[in-house]
């Protein structure tokens, strides 16, 4: 087909000789054809079309990529001749850097539905050259990691040695989609979530007297996990006193948040303090009530069949621990004013007497 009608874009890939890195070309079809063919999508007027014309709509065709030999030979089908170049929907992925990737790459829709569609193509002139080692010692890597749950940033490798003030305007893409919220050489992430991982592309324009080039770099971003540096955090009980009714059953819940640990051995127990005595209570098993990639909330309840007068003099302590340290929360029971009658009080005292006998014969105290 005649490529003279294709729109042209010039790109520069300055690769680091010290690292493995990838490169991506987008089939960035021109605006005039987008309305006719290249972007005949189901977007409503309020939706902003994606940077890539074909990725979203299933009935839009994929594209065909070609490489134009410098000697004027016929166009070559990328898939047949270049195993290190992968065609992925509307992108072309170069798995290995090298000056041999320099050349002209053409993309056009696979399906041509009308005479107008013939000109719906893009020619990308790619220049590939090694980055001078002297340019910057601490340039950002093409593989960057973000720690889950923390703050972080993604830096454009080709601009990471420049201050934000010096930096030209940058266009960012994530997994092929335009990120419109930042034009800086760094994307700042307030809290890292798993969805921040992906393939990021940063573009900026470099001009000389003769022409203008888009300098592009690709960054693979992973979200990673690391052991918490914090002790567990007791979410409940919040209050140190709890109003109760004598003679009635009572459940006190202890809920604690444990930060991520690769080897996770959480400890959660209830114990009771009574004067100078202290003992652990056998209570139902702890259960995980919420688990995310960065933390886990665990709950364990203490159950009193009937609240007694003695319970009012005791302190109930929830103890939680991880490999960093422990946290405790004490709860003192307080009788609800105006609750219960004489019968309740006699009943409670009878229970207390039975419990004293049972308590003295069964519990092993430790100080």
């Amino acid at each position: 087909f005649n490529i003279s009608g294709c729109s042209t874009k010039k790109l520069l890939w300055a690769y680091s000789t010290r690292s493995e890195e990838e490169f991506i070309l987008f089939c960035d079809l021109p605006e005039p054809q987008k309305s006719h063919f290249c972007h005949r999508s189901q977007l409503s007027p309020t939706q902003v079309p994606d940077h890539l014309p074909f990725t979203d709509s299933k009935d839009l065709p994929d594209v065909q990529w070609y490489r134009q030999p410098s000697n004027g030979d016929p166009l070559e089908d990328i898939r047949k001749s270049y195993p290190h170049i992968i065609q992925d929907k509307c992108t072309l992925r170069f798995l290995t850097p090298g000056v041999n990737n320099t050349g002209s790459y053409i993309c056009r829709p696979k399906m041509i539905k009308s005479p107008y569609d013939v000109a719906c193509c893009v020619k990308m002139i790619l220049e590939v050259k090694p980055q001078s080692n002297a340019s910057c010692e601490n340039s950002a890597s093409h593989k960057q990691d973000l720690l889950l749950g923390s703050t972080g940033s993604i830096s454009c490798p080709s601009l990471s040695c420049q201050s934000d003030a010096q930096s030209p305007e940058v266009t960012w893409y994530k997994n092929g989609k335009l990120l419109s919220m930042t034009r800086s050489n760094r994307i700042v992430v307030d809290e890292v979530y798993i969805y921040h991982q992906g393939t990021y592309v940063c573009d900026y324009t470099q001009s000389d007297t003769a022409s203008s080039w888009t300098v592009r770099a690709v960054v693979q971003v992973r979200t990673i996990v690391g052991d918490t540096k914090l002790k567990p955090d007791i979410l409940d009980p919040v209050e140190s006193t709890l109003e109760v009714e004598l003679g009635k059953p009572l459940t006190i819940s202890c809920k604690a948040r444990f930060g991520f640990e690769r080897v996770f051995n959480p400890v959660m127990k209830w114990y009771i303090k009574d004067a100078d005595l202290e003992w652990e209570v056998s209570v139902p098993e702890a259960k995980s009530i919420k688990s995310t990639l960065k933390d886990e909330i665990i709950e364990r309840n203490i159950i009193l069949e009937k609240v007694t007068q003695r319970d009012l003099r005791r302190t109930f302590v929830c103890f939680v621990q991880n490999s960093i340290g422990n946290t405790t929360q004490s709860v003192q029971l307080k009788e609800k004013r105006g609750s219960g009658g004489l019968n309740d009080i006699f009943e409670a005292q009878k229970i207390e007497w039975h419990e004293t006998v049972r308590f003295q014969s069964h519990h092993h105290h430790h100080h």
């Epitope: 990691d145 990673i224 996990v225 690391g226 052991d227 690769r262 080897v263 990639l293 490999s323």
Partner: antibody, heavy 124, light 107 residues
Framework: QVQLQESGPGLVKPSETLSLTCTVS????????WSWIRQPPGKGLEWIGY???????NYNPSLKSRVTISVDTSKNQFSLKLSSVTAADTAVYYC??????????????????WGQGTTVTVSS | AIQLTQSPSSLSASVGDRVTITCRAS??????LAWYQQKPGKAPKFLIY???SLESGVPSRFSGSGSGTDFTLTISSLQPEDFATYYC?????????FGQGTRLEIK
């Protein structure tokens, strides 16, 4: 690009303590786990243990009584000490960055960057 | 400790061949498996994590599959640089363990 370099004596006498250091360059020691792995001549790989940059450790039970791994974040280094060595501890010792990748709603650990290895011979 | 058994222990193949290496765990390890390539005198190089996720920069001719106890590493079309020893590794429980390795040689 992160690079790891092992250093330490290549020859250790039986019953003595083997000491190796791994220096991390081109990146931070923070936020990662750091492992030691060894490979006896002509054999497979054996994991010795890891340390998180904050100091949490986890050791292979078969070596636990003899192993200590420590970290010095100010120097971007972590170290291995293996006491009471015998000829069976002769191996190539590797240090590696051990990363927990959060993906597909789970965690996947992998040793993604390795040192080139250092040969340690235990002999009198 | 979880034992990983690789088969075959060694394998001869030609450039362009499709090769499959298997790794069997002594108990279920979900998808907590990684694959490494090691060349003589060199450190292992990581290829695949989570049983099937390819590390960026690793050629797409490498692929991993499996879950539970049975896993495979496939090289769709062998290249000269692929001749090496391959190890599987489990991270499901401690201690972390490796398979005994599969040596891939040129026929």
């Amino acid at each position: 690009q992160v690079q790891l370099q092992e250093s330490g004596p290549g020859l250790v006498k039986p019953s003595e303590t083997l000491s190796l250091t791994c220096t991390v360059s081109g990146g931070s020691i923070n936020n990662y786990y750091w492992s030691w792995i060894r490979q006896p001549p002509g054999k497979g790989l054996e994991w010795i243990g890891y340390i998180f940059y904050s100091g949490t450790t986890n050791y292979n039970p078969s070596l636990k009584s003899r192993v200590t791994i420590s970290v010095d974040t100010s120097k971007n280094q972590f170290s291995l000490k293996l006491s009471s060595v015998t000829a069976a501890d002769t191996a190539v010792y590797y240090c590696a960055r051990d990363v927990g990748i959060a993906a597909r709603n789970s965690y996947y650990y992998v040793m993604d960057v390795w040192g080139q290895g250092t040969t340690v011979t235990v002999s009198s | 400790a979880i034992q990983l058994t690789q088969s075959p222990s060694s394998l001869s193949a030609s450039v362009g061949d499709r090769v499959t290496i298997t790794c069997r765990a002594s108990q279920g390890i979900s998808s907590a498996l990684a694959w490494y390539q090691q060349k003589p005198g060199k450190a292992p190089k990581f290829l695949i994590y989570g049983a099937s996720s390819l590390e960026s920069g690793v050629p797409s001719r490498f692929s991993g599959s499996g879950s539970g106890t049975d896993f495979t590493l496939t090289i769709s079309s062998l290249q000269p640089e692929d001749f090496a020893t391959y190890y599987c590794q489990q991270f499901n429980s401690y201690p972390i363990t490796f398979g005994q390795g599969t040596r891939l040689e040129i026929k």
